[in-house]
Amino acid sequence: EEELQVIQPDKSVSVAAGESAILHCTVTSLIPVGPIQWFRGAGPARELIYNQKEGHFPRVTTVSESTKRENMDFSISISNITPADAGTYYCVKFRKGSPDTEFKSGAGTELSVRAKPSAPVVSGPAARATPQHTVSFTCESHGFSPRDITLKWFKNGNELSDFQTNVDPVGESVSYSIHSTAKVVLTREDVHSQVICEVAHVTLQGDPLRGTANLSETIRVPPTLEVTQQPVRAENQVNVTCQVRKFYPQRLQLTWLENGNVSRTETASTVTENKDGTYNWMSWLLVNVSAHRDDVKLTCQVEHDGQPAVSKSHDLKVSAHPKEQGSNTAAENTGSNERNIYGGSG
């Protein structure tokens, strides 16, 4: 009778994580008597996966009735495969004895595990940035196998090109991680914008995973200020308004100064939202000009989102009472301690 051969017909087997892997092995002879063992890897550090003779291998089942003498099929099924199970598996015939001695090994079957990447997590900068600045976004996904993966960046559906991507580790591993950093230039219209990281992998069957970041969490659009004097409502009264336009986020505090002295401070509450996601707000003062002997310098000072204050001033002439005056008129004044000013916002 010809000498026993150990046949492993599959050079490689690919299995999705969580599924069972069937590793085929047959022998060509019933001689010699002795057990079959399965190992992962070769050499002295090989890992025992299954021993026909003894041991407890809860994830391994034999495909056929391997306890019988006439059996020549020693294929096994390994349940609940994880990326850690990847490797080359050898079916090895031993000759019965004390100890059992290795008689012949199969050529090996390489098990590769297809593991899905985790949902991409996109994170932006720690601090807000203003339009025209470039900010970095990172995207991370972990636990996938095989190593081949595609990552794309989009801003509002438009593919970005300024990014760098790394897949780790560089060498062989049971699973891999991807890390990508994209650079995005902010515009004033980006409050409603989204940055999307899209990951495509063989395990996803053409349905890529996406992670998103809203630029509303990253952008700060500083306000523009306009101070105007409205027509006289009643004799000796002037309505001065401060228009705060196109700001984001909403966090804003406004202070009226009269000749450099704080008149009133208020926090933006009833704002109006623009189509681009920015906000507008208006505050007004009703000034009783008859209470002033000299010209009044009114300043609208705005502190937005904790940033240094910006301001706009308006010079209110009290020597004559025209129906309307323009804003931002430069004028020297000594200031006034009289407080006959009323305010509001809207």
Partner: antibody
Framework: EVQLVESGGGLVQPGGSLRLSCAAS????????MHWVRQATGKGLEWVSV???????YYPGSVKGRFTISRENAKNSLYLQMNSLRVGDTAVYYC????????????WGQGTMVTVSS | DIQMTQSPSSLSASIGDKVTITCRAS??????LAWFQQKPGKAPKSLIY???SLQSGVPSKFSGSGSGTDFTLTISSLQPEDFATYYC?????????FGQGTKLEIK
């Protein structure tokens, strides 16, 4: 049903010969090592011989050169040719199948009695 | 040849008892050890192979353990049908050899 049935036992004089048979059924006979085991009355079990799948044979010193094991796979039959019989060979002879992957016995016949006496 | 020594040679026990029979080999036999049960006038019945593997159809009250030279057979709760003679056997190499037997009797 897996079954082994021995036959051929009987009374024989010392120095005589006897041929035992074991008829196998219910399994692929050619795929198993087959053994003979004997048991003298009131005594323990003694292994007598084996024939492997490939026809290789082994015997203990007590019967070597006197007993010959053989098989006929086409007939699903196992044989034990016993020559130069001695009084000490008196026993019940069982055939057994090395049915496990490691050749452990799993199935036994009911036995046949061999008596060597003058 | 490898000698197999069983102890005790005989053992008296009651229904429901747990009993242990030991078997010692004169040299290392790995775990190629089988246990058989034999009742008077009957052929032996295979119980355990490779020291601890139960033959098909054998109840789980029988268990075996050991490796190398020292082995045990344990019957967890004796029933009337368990009173018999028990043999161990090494089958690591020819000639296969048996222990002398342990007769389990009812007390």
């Amino acid at each position: 049903e897996v079954q082994l049935v021995e036959s051929g036992g009987g009374l024989v004089q010392p120095g005589g010969s006897l041929r035992l048979s074991c008829a196998a059924s219910g399994f692929t006979f050619s795929s198993y090592d087959m053994h003979w085991v004997r048991q003298a009355t009131g005594k323990g079990l003694e292994w007598v011989s084996v024939i492997g799948i490939a026809g290789d044979t082994y015997y203990p010193g007590s019967v070597k050169g006197r007993f010959t094991i053989s098989r006929e796979n086409a007939k699903n039959s196992l044989y034990l040719q016993m020559n130069s019989l001695r009084v000490g060979d008196t026993a019940v002879y069982y055939c057994a199948r090395g049915g496990s992957w490691d050749d452990a016995f799993d199935i036994w016949g009911q036995g046949t009695m061999v008596t060597v006496s003058s | 040849d490898i000698q197999m020594t069983q102890s005790p040679s005989s053992l008296s026990a009651s229904i429901g008892d747990k009993v242990t029979i030991t078997c010692r080999a004169s040299q290392d036999i790995n775990n190629y050890l089988a246990w058989f049960q034999q009742k008077p006038g009957k052929a032996p019945k295979s119980l355990i192979y490779t020291a601890s593997s139960l033959q098909s159809g054998v109840p789980s009250k029988f268990s075996g353990s050991g490796s190398g030279t020292d082995f045990t057979l344990t019957i967890s709760s004796l029933q009337p049908e368990d009173f018999a003679t028990y043999y161990c056997q090494q089958y690591v190499s020819y000639p296969y050899t048996f222990g002398q037997g342990t007769k389990l009797e009812i007390k």
